[in-house]
Amino acid sequence: KAMHVAQPAVVLASSRGIASFVCEYASPGKATEVRVTVLRQADSQVTEVCAATYMMGNELTFLDDSICTGTSSGNQVNLTIQGLRAMDTGLYICKVELMYPPPYYLGIGNGTQIYVIDPEPCPDSDF
C-alpha cells in the first residue's frame, strides 16, 4: 500500500514572484487528516518552506506569516508560494502525510523546479 505523490516537473513564477502548482496524492487509506509540507532543495540544502495540516473537505490553513496559501479538493492540493525572488529558484518538493486515522502513510513527490526571474527595473523616463 504505497502512497504516490505527483507534482509538475517545472513551474515558472510570475513577474510578481508568485508560483502555483498542484500536488496530487493517491491515498491508500481513507484519511480524514492530512499534512502537506513544501520542502525546498537547493545545493544539497533542505529547508521547510511551509506546512499545513487539514481535515479532508476543509481548507488548508497555513500559519499567518507563511508565504504559502492553498486549497484542497479531494486528493489534490493547489499550492501557491508568494514573495519569490531569483535567489529562491530551486526544487520544491511536496511531502504528504496521512495523519489520521492510523495507519500513517508517507508520500514524497519528485519535486517541482520553480524558476524565478526578478523583473527588470523600469527605466527612468524624462518627459
Epitope: K1, A2, R35, E48
Partner: antibody
Framework: QVQLVESGGGVVQPGRSLRLSCIAS????????MHWVRQAPGKGLEWVAV????????HYADSVKGRFTISRDNSKNTLYLQMNSLRAEDTAVYYC????????????WGQGTLVTVSS | EIVLTQSPGTLSLSPGERATLSCRAS???????LAWYQQKPGQAPRLLIY???SRATGIPDRFSGSGSGTDFTLTISRLEPEDFAVYYC?????????FGPGTKVDIK
Amino acid sequence: QVQLVESGGGVVQPGRSLRLSCIASGFTFSSYGMHWVRQAPGKGLEWVAVNWYDGSNKHYADSVKGRFTISRDNSKNTLYLQMNSLRAEDTAVYYCARGGVWGPYFDYWGQGTLVTVSS
Amino acid sequence: EIVLTQSPGTLSLSPGERATLSCRASQSVSSSYLAWYQQKPGQAPRLLIYGASSRATGIPDRFSGSGSGTDFTLTISRLEPEDFAVYYCQQYGSSPFTFGPGTKVDIK
C-alpha cells in the same frame, strides 16, 4: 547542535507506572515528529510511539497500545511517555528520537534511559 | 505490518574488506522509505542512510545504500576498525515503523 536528553527510568514492579521525559534542544521542536524507540537487553530495536508536530496525532505499536501514552509540551521542548500497567517484557532502554525531514526515520537519538520491570 | 529480515545474522570480516548486508521486506517498501543504522555496544543507534541510498550528515562515503521494493543492501566498501558494530534497517513508509533484527559485523 541537536540534543535529546531522557530521564525518568528506573526499577518498577509489574503493574505499576512510570513516566519518561525527553528534553530537546538545538532545533524547532514543533516542526518534527518525536518518537520513543526501545531496546530490550541483548535484543534489537522496537519502535514504541510517535507524537506528531503539534501534538494532536499519536500512533502506537500494538505491544503498548492502551497502556502507554505519548505526549509533548512544545512550549517546554519536552516529550513524555506515560507507561502504565508495566510488564516484565517492557524492560528495555528507552530512546527518544527525532523524526527526519524526509519522513519518520530517526536522525537524532538521546542516550537512552533504562526501565526495569521486576518484582 | 511490514516485517524486515536481515542477513546474514553475523558477518565475520577483516579490516579493509568489503561488507555487504541485506535487508528484505515482507511487502514492498513504498518509494524506498528505508533507513540503515549503526549501533555500538552501550551507545544509541546512529543514522547512516535514509531513502535507501542517501547518506546522513557526516557519514563517510565508504557507506552506501541501494535497492528498492523488497530488497535493500548496505555496503561498506572498506571496513575500518570503528565499523565493527550491529547494523539495523528500518522502514518508514507506513506505521507501525519496523526494524530488522540486525546484522552483527565482527572482526574475523
